[in-house]
């Protein structure tokens, strides 16, 4: 099921480093701390999972980057991307970027001196 | 797409044994790889995993300390080495690929190999 | 330590009868982690279904995944003698990954 997406570059360039990693535990975990007892994501309940799975799973595929620290910004960003159209108000948009920015500190990493997670084109 | 086991046998109690997982007809640096191993007439028990870049490594408990998984990409090898070994460690070892979605996530072995065999007896 | 524990340990049904196996998890597990393997004898185990629901490439619609939190739930509709198995759920998202005991199918 895995498949090349699609960007170029040489093998050490963030982009594409983070596009060879599995963003989706991420996601999960976050909108989880966020969601808490809402209905559900994705096709994945998670009123009642515990967050450590998910949070195992993405720092483990975090740690994956060649250059996890220089890389984080991009892969919190692509986070953002990916989770956009699914954060319903702007409330949840502010909720969603609180909890990624205290993402790599979970993971045990250092958080990204700056990094900006305002989507182009997007609520985000 | 195959995983082949190699390095299997009979060993004494206490004693030590390599086996190691060759990979081929996929790229082997793309994917974490883990071993699972069949008692006779038992169950599945997860053994250990390692990620792509061997940056991340988990083991049961019933072999942590006893057990070390490593890997060469540049190989396609993933090898399992076995120290301190008991009867209770007499199974079919298998090596197994771990791929995830990319679209929705989920994680699990989609290859695996025919297993190897280590008996453990004096 | 995710337990994982299935029941039952082994079942009988005729062919074109309904098989249901149910796996509980001592704790909370993700759809996204929960795995179902069928494995027949002297054959590695073969992937069924991930993400708790999702049937991996060329497996029949006869078989079926459910479930979340603790319970989780493989039904095989319309038994075929070749599903003859033993089948295995497995947690994956928090180390270390469990299998459940298996429970084994056959024909009656």
């Known amino acids: 099921m895995r498949r090349e997406r699609g960007r170029q570059g040489d093998s050490s360039s963030c982009e594409r480093q983070v596009d060879r990693v599995n963003l989706k535990p991420c996601e999960q975990h976050i909108m989880q701390r966020i969601m808490g007892e809402q209905e559900q994501y994705d096709s994945y309940d998670i009123r009642s999972t515990r967050s450590s799975d998910q949070q195992q799973r993405c720092c483990d595929e975090l740690n994956e980057m060649e250059n996890t620290q220089r890389c984080m910004c991009e892969a919190l960003q692509q986070i953002m991307e990916n989770q956009c159209d699914r954060l319903q108000d702007r409330q949840m948009v502010q909720q969603f970027k609180r909890e990624l920015m205290n993402l790599p500190q979970q993971c045990n990493f250092r958080a990204p001196q700056r990094c900006d997670l305002d989507v182009s084109g997007g609520r985000c | 797409q195959q995983l082949k086991e190699s390095g299997g046998g009979l060993v004494k109690p206490g004693g030590s044994l390599k086996l190691c997982c060759k990979a081929s007809g996929f790229t082997f640096s793309d994917y974490n790889m883990n071993w699972v191993r069949q008692a006779p007439g038992k169950g599945l028990e997860w053994i250990g995993s390692?990620?792509?870049?061997?940056?991340?490594?988990y083991y049961a408990d019933s072999v942590k300390g006893r057990f070390t998984l490593s890997r060469d990409n540049a190989q396609s090898t993933v090898c399992l080495q076995l120290n301190s070994l008991t009867a209770a460690d007499t199974a079919t070892y298998f090596c197994?690929?771990?791929?995830?979605?990319?679209?929705?996530?989920?994680?699990?072995?989609?290859?695996w190999g025919p297993g190897t065999l280590v008996t453990v007896s004096s | 330590y995710v337990m994982m524990t299935q029941t039952p340990s082994s079942v009988s049904e005729a062919v074109g009868g309904t098989v249901t196996i149910y796996c509980r998890a001592s704790?909370?597990?993700?759809?996204?982690?929960l795995v179902w393997y069928q494995q027949k004898p002297g054959q590695p185990p073969k992937l069924l279904i991930y993400?708790?629901?999702t049937r991996a490439t060329g497996v029949p619609s006869r078989f079926r995944g459910s479930g979340s939190g603790t319970q989780f739930t493989l039904t095989i509709s319309g038994m075929k003698a070749e599903d003859v198995a033993t089948y295995y759920c497995?947690?994956?998202?928090?180390?270390?990954?469990?299998f459940g005991g298996g429970t084994e199918v056959v024909v009656k």
């Open positions: 497995q947690q994956n998202g928090n180390s270390p990954y469990t």
């Open positions: 390692i990620t792509r870049s061997s940056r991340t490594i």
């Open positions: 197994a690929r771990e791929d995830f979605n990319v679209y929705t996530g989920p994680y699990y072995y989609d290859v």
């Open positions: 704790q909370s597990v993700s759809n996204m982690f």
């Open positions: 993400g708790a629901s």
